[in-house]
Interface confidence: low
């Protein structure tokens, strides 16, 4: 999906009002120094591409993020503010329902959500690039 035509300010508002708090809740009890940020993004569409990938694509050691509160709110925000996004996700959602993995918070998931926090912060700060 090409995130170029999303309403970035609306997505930013959704992040600031709820998604950011849900990410913090998920990470509660984890030291901020525990994970290094290894994933970056260069502009807002790129950030959303990386955010979508880390949030919804199962990875080795972490298959359960898509059912978390922050993930559901991320999906809702993208569906509302990115034209045509929900249509591209129908097949992926059906495939995910068939898997229905057990919900476990692994260290790998915590690391992945730490990366997500960094990507969201970067999404919110393109202003640094403006002189």
């Amino acid at each position: 999906y090409d995130f170029t035509n999303c309403d970035f300010e609306k997505i930013k508002a959704a992040y600031l009002s709820t998604i950011s708090k849900d990410l913090i809740t998920y990470m509660s009890g984890t030291k901020s120094t525990e994970f290094n940020n290894t994933v970056s993004c260069s502009n807002r569409p790129h950030c959303l591409t990386e955010i979508q990938s880390l949030t919804f694509n199962p990875t080795a050691g972490c298959a359960s993020l898509a059912k978390e509160m922050f993930a559901m709110k991320t999906k809702a925000a993208l569906a509302i503010w990115c034209p045509g996004y929900s249509e591209t996700q129908i097949n992926a959602t059906q495939a995910m329902k068939k898997r229905r993995k057990r919900k476990v918070t692994t260290n790998k998931c915590l690391e992945q959500v730490s990366q997500l926090q960094g990507l969201w912060r970067r999404f919110n700060r393109p202003l640094l690039k403006q002189q």
């Epitope: 940020n37 970056s40 990507l119």
Partner: antibody, heavy 117, light 111 residues
Framework: QVQLRESGPGLVAPSQSLSITCTVS????????VNWVRQPPGKGLEWLGV???????NYHSAFISRLSITKDNSKSQVFLKLNSLQTDDTATYYC???????????WGAGTTVTVSS | DIVLTQSPASLAVSLGQRATISCKAS??????????MNWYQQKPGQSPKLLIY???NLESGIPARFSGSGSGTDFTLNIHPVEEEDAATYYC?????????FGSGTKLEIK
Amino acid sequence: QVQLRESGPGLVAPSQSLSITCTVSGFSLTSYGVNWVRQPPGKGLEWLGVIWDDGTTNYHSAFISRLSITKDNSKSQVFLKLNSLQTDDTATYYCAKGSIYWYFDVWGAGTTVTVSS
Amino acid sequence: DIVLTQSPASLAVSLGQRATISCKASQSVDYEGDSHMNWYQQKPGQSPKLLIYVASNLESGIPARFSGSGSGTDFTLNIHPVEEEDAATYYCQQSNEVPFTFGSGTKLEIK
């Protein structure tokens, strides 16, 4: 392993231009920004400018009229060009990788530039 | 531009004691709950090395005797217990807005 290596001319005559190349490895210039910082002998660190992952730049206002930072992503190289050099531009010039939070997590060893006739 | 005022300019600390370095910013470097203040160590003839990022986060591979604290405009770097190898110049740097700026440096001598 992330590495940056500066290569410069060493000696530049006053009023001439300085060109330094920063060659990076272990990361992609399309994912992270590269900053230039200089340090005159016996003095502190001075930020010159940055070229971001998407190719946009920011320059320190004190250098904006004579500084240019460009890059070649395919060659993993970043270029600094500083025009109209004076003796007080004598310094060690460093390139440094920017992190996702914009601090400088890896630095090159630096290249010493002397401006003298 | 954000001006960073570091103090003291130099200090001498006995081996095993605590070294405290202050950095005051001319305006807040906080953004969305993060304090974008960083600390670097530079030894003679070497390039700077990142110690602490975003006010209090210890860079990977840096000994736990280094710690950072503060928010808004007032920040502190603590080294305890000080070791011989900590003799160096320490710089604070803000990454909250461009132009990025550094403090003038604090030279630490071990007695």
